[in-house]
């Protein structure tokens, strides 16, 4: 562990109430193929415990979805991954809209610091699938 | 190699017969930019040779495709990556539907064990492009 | 650095003139969360300085975009990442079309050599967003 190979892969636990766009995550072998090795969960949000550059990746699939359901809503369904605390470091890292699709998937490299808490905000009225092969979120420490 | 840096990037060889949804892969410098360094191919399916957490990634582009061709089929075209053998470890790891798009691309972290064979199942009537920059599949060992 | 952990994450600087499909990138802490640690920029194009296998990833979001704007153009908007110099090694590594979506995102493993310059060509009449959470391009050295 001293090598700093912090890594986590999470599965969706639940969505927040209507005015809370955050997705709430869970991880651990008892739940399936999700795990936390270094990072930790704080009320369903992922907290970084080691400084470094991380590969952040996410896939979210909408639970009830057809190309019409994503396109006909007035407010487009959007997924944003960002640092939500500490407030001084709050920033959006990765953002995608579903448009006429039902799944978004992306990844990026970004510097993260110990104590950074990552939030994944899903805005819109559609809820995500909780199938573990359709919706997941992970980080991988790649270098100091 | 003793570091465990097992890694592979594969290109599409061919699809199976009608009742076999699997994609068959190939890799090696003679074929272009694909390679196998650790993992191996067993009848076109990728077999893991070292336990660990892997980053699995895939991109599949449909060969003759427009947004209408993906949306007008009754059975949506779907790509699933999973462990197909040994049977005791069979599970879907990553799943995406094309909906109104012609390409899917995603990645995830997952624990894999020596002997796990990964299958990539493409269901639907549309065939994938064999262009090496449009359809590819790879794994990268990232930690024990 | 001797470990060979070359890594870069870039943000969009600007597009080229009409007959130049290349995207021009920039990176550095002063610009936000982008950085270059090993690779370098040559007139907005990313140049590799260490041989190895790299994970290349990209996300591009179109600036003024709806599902109709991407579908109604005769020439589909396409993004291709490739080695553009030296000419002897010129090849397309990764290619995606937007179809009815407004964002593409993908990643792949590929061998790169010192001196390889990567170009990201966006063809079509639509322009990319310069928001740093919507459009980015990066590489990560993963093994020799």
């Amino acid at each position: 562990e001293s090598l700093g190979w912090d890594i986590a892969e999470l599965q969706l636990n639940h969505t927040g109430p209507q005015q809370d766009p955050r997705l709430y995550w869970q991880g651990g072998p008892a739940l399936g193929r999700s795990f936390l090795r270094g990072p930790e969960l704080d009320k369903g949000q992922l907290r970084i415990r080691r400084d470094g550059i991380y590969m952040v990746h996410i896939q979210v699939t909408l639970a009830i979805c057809s190309s019409t359901s994503t396109s006909r809503h007035h407010h487009p369904t959007t997924l944003a991954v960002g640092i939500c605390s500490p407030a001084s470091r709050s920033i959006s890292l990765l953002r995608l809209s579903f448009h006429q699709g039902c799944t978004i998937a992306s990844q990026r490299l970004t510097p993260l610091a110990r104590g950074d808490t990552l939030c994944t905000n899903l805005t819109g009225t559609l809820l995500p699938s909780r199938n573990t092969d359709e919706t997941f979120f992970g980080v991988q420490w790649v270098r100091p | 190699e003793s570091l465990g840096w097992d890694i592979a990037e594969l290109q599409l060889n061919h699809t199976g017969p009608q009742q076999d949804p699997r994609l068959y892969w190939q890799g090696g410098p003679a074929l272009g930019r694909s390679f196998l360094r650790g993992p191996e191919l067993d009848k076109g399916q990728l077999r893991i040779r070292r336990d660990g957490i892997y980053m699995v990634h895939i991109q599949v582009t449909l060969a003759i495709c427009s947004s209408t061709s993906t949306s007008r089929h009754h059975h949506p075209t779907t790509l699933a990556v999973g462990i197909c053998s040994p049977a005791s470890r069979s599970i879907s790891l990553l799943r995406l539907s094309f909906h109104q798009g012609c390409t899917i691309a995603s990645q995830r972290l997952t624990p894999l064990a020596r002997g796990d064979t990964l299958c990539t199942n493409l269901t639907g009537t549309l065939l994938p492009s064999r262009n090496t920059d449009e359809t590819f599949f790879g794994v990268q060992w990232v930690r024990p | 650095e001797s470990l060979g952990w070359d890594i870069a994450e870039l943000q969009l600087n600007h597009t080229g003139p009409q007959q130049d499909p290349r995207l021009y990138w920039q990176g550095g802490p002063a610009l936000g969360r982008s950085f270059l640690r090993g690779p370098e920029l040559d007139k907005g194009q990313l140049r590799i300085r260490r041989d190895g296998i790299y994970m290349v990833h990209i996300q591009v979001t179109l600036a003024i975009c709806s599902s109709t704007s991407t579908s109604r153009h005769h020439h589909p908007t396409t993004l291709a990442v490739g080695i553009c110099s030296p000419a002897s090694r010129s090849i397309s590594l990764l290619r995606l079309s937007f179809h009815q979506g407004c964002t593409i995102a993908s990643q792949r493993l590929t061998p790169l050599a010192r001196g390889d310059t990567l170009c990201t060509n966006l063809t079509g009449t639509l322009l990319p967003s310069r928001n740093t959470d919507e459009t980015f391009f990066g590489v990560q050295w993963v093994r020799p």
């Epitope: 639940h14 969505t15 927040g16 109430p17 209507q18 005015q19 809370d20 709430y24 639970a63 009830i64 359901s69 009225t125 559609l126 809820l127 699938s129 909780r130 199938n131 | - | -």
Partner: antibody, heavy 119, light 107 residues
Amino acid sequence: QVQLVQSGSELKKPGASVKVSCKASGYTFTNYGMNWVRQAPGQGLEWMGWINTYTGEPTYADGFTGRFVFSLDTSASTAYLQISSLKAEDTAVYFCAREEDYRYVFNYWGQGTLVTVSS
Amino acid sequence: DIQMTQSPSSLSASVGDRVTITCQASQDISNYLNWYQQKPGKAPKLLIYDTSRLHAGVPSRFSGSGSGTDYTFTISSLQPEDIATYFCQQGVTLPLTFGQGTKLEIK
């Protein structure tokens, strides 16, 4: 503890208006959306829509646009449902409801307000 | 809109009986299914959310199961205080929709 207390029963004539209140206590009012649910006599539950208590933005279900208005008095931690041009078929019990941790799962309900429309 | 069809509309059972109510959605609702109990003149009370999760304080004789479009609510051993009307509700997208209710009576 969380409580939603609604105003009392109302008897109205067709064409009149009514304003039902739902006073919240035991939590920060602007943290949770307020939903409205209708139940006609002997009938099932019908979701009418909700109001974002932070932004004030209402969302109405089909069939509840025009004559139905959701509003707020955040200083009083109160949500309101106003129905204008009342019709006999508006006779029902109206409930306000709130989520806790999960989207679209209603843990807390007001006691209901019976609105009777009769000439 | 997603239609929720609940059955039966009413049922009569004895104390100690196992009681089952079903709810069918007009499309896959991905386990976003909740069950409420309503007694006469009262507001509904949440019993089960996300198909099978028991709300805090709800007796363990209540349970839920199902997937896709078909869901089941079960009372393993009916008690006199369980006399009420039970509603299912889909919580996957707006507009939220409820089943028409099942009125449970004691024989």
